[in-house]
């Protein structure tokens, strides 16, 4: 699988989609769930409803939210409120039985708010904000990894 | 543990002028915005005036504009409050408290002082 | 500038009973783009300074005991003590940290019964 990026920005909703073979995948569950390193298991984070016919309904875990188009063949995977611990390797999984198959290996990138002072200092109030409401990038930006890049650093 | 301790509170004549100092410690003060809020005797609490981090940004109520001056000294964590043309109406305990702030959370007031009483009369 | 209204004034509750504050803003202190309210709650009890309880009108500070939560939205709230013990007497205001100025509600005392 290649990975794909999904760029999103720190505050901001992230919205990261898997597409699959409906037929294929037909009467699975779906899951998103963490990379922890290169080797690593993949970490649950959330899933869909444990009745596959009720998969279009929304499941949410803490910031995370998770909804299956199974007619469609799309999973959709939420992040509310990015932050920069959000940034990382993820996959989209199909269930069958205590197996998981690979939809999508994803990155996920989190960029800075370009509203961001970031500074506890500052004086910041969002009453004075709401006039650049336009300059907040609600969709995600996704791209595929290209030969050669690296997709986790190397380890020492 | 945070610790912000007012000084220069006392009586004034109407016209007159005070100097409040809000000495620091504790914590990283010349990161984190300031505030001072007023308390009248028996009412309630009115905000100042508020400093961010690195003097950069004021910001005033209007019942004190042109009258009173915040400023900071990082090096020495302290808050300042310049109280020009004092009137009777500012007779309060006035309370520094450091701000948390930064983008997501705006101004609220996590650590208070035990306040300064300014008593203005003739 | 925007005008908090806290009702009532004071209030007087059984010890284990609930207390209700409520607080009413001018405008909406709503920020669309990450759907928070930015409507906060302090407690002075006597002689001492305000300690803040919540923010983000339903976010507890942390140590707050869990009989504190706020509620609302938009421009209407309430800051409930689910089970009211002594040392919750004091006065209660809520405060605005949408916009500059910043605005405090004219307090509620809280009393036992």
């Known amino acids: 699988h290649n990975t794909t990026v999904f760029q999103g920005v720190e505050g901001q909703s992230l919205q990261v989609s898997c597409p699959y073979d409906s037929m294929k995948h037909w009467g699975r569950r779906k899951a998103w769930c963490r990379q922890l390193g290169e080797k690593g298991p993949c970490q649950r984070v959330v899933s869909t409803h444990n009745l596959w016919l009720l998969s279009f309904l929304r499941r949410r875990n803490g910031s995370t939210a998770i909804t299956d188009d199974t007619l469609g063949g799309t999973l959709t995977i939420t992040l509310r409120n990015l932050q920069p611990h959000d940034a990382g390797f993820y996959q989209c999984q199909s269930l069958h039985g205590s197996e998981a198959d690979t939809l999508r290996k994803v990155l996920v990138e989190v960029l800075a708010d370009p509203l961001d002072h970031r500074d506890a200092g500052d004086l910041w109030v969002p009453g004075e904000s709401e006039s650049f409401e336009d300059a907040h990038v609600e969709h995600s930006i996704s791209r595929s990894l290209l030969e050669g890049e690296i997709p986790f650093p190397p380890t020492s | 543990e945070v610790q912000l301790l007012e000084s220069g509170g006392g009586l004034v004549q109407p016209g007159g002028s005070l100097r409040l100092s809000c000495a620091a410690s504790?914590?990283?003060?010349?990161?984190?915005?300031m505030t001072w809020v007023r308390q009248a005797p028996g009412k309630g609490l009115e905000w100042v005036s508020a400093i961010s981090a690195n003097a950069g940004k004021t910001y005033y109520a209007d019942s004190v504009k042109g009258r009173f001056t915040i400023s900071r000294d990082n090096s020495k964590n302290t808050l300042y409050l310049q109280m020009n043309s004092l009137r009777a109406e500012d007779t309060a305990v006035y309370y520094c408290?450091?701000?948390?702030?930064?983008?997501?959370?705006?101004?609220?007031?996590?650590?208070w002082g035990q306040g300064t009483l300014v008593t203005v009369s003739s | 500038d925007i005008v908090m209204t806290q009702s009532p004034d004071s209030l007087a509750v059984s010890l284990g009973e609930r207390a209700t504050i409520n607080c009413k803003s001018s405008q909406s202190v709503l920020y669309s783009s990450n759907n928070k309210n930015y409507l906060a709650w302090y407690q002075q009890k006597p002689g001492q300074p305000p300690k803040l309880l919540i923010y983000w009108a339903s976010t507890r500070e942390s140590g707050v005991p869990d009989r504190f939560s706020g509620s609302g939205s938009g421009t209407d709230f309430t800051l409930t003590i689910s089970s009211l013990q002594a040392e919750d007497v004091a006065v209660y205001y809520c405060?605005?940290?949408?916009?500059?100025?910043?605005?405090f509600g004219g307090g509620t005392k809280v009393e036992i019964k």
């Open positions: 504790g914590f990283t003060f010349s990161t984190h915005a």
């Open positions: 405060q605005q940290h949408y916009i500059w100025p910043i605005t």
């Open positions: 408290a450091s701000l948390r702030g930064g983008y997501e959370v705006g101004p609220t007031f996590d650590s």
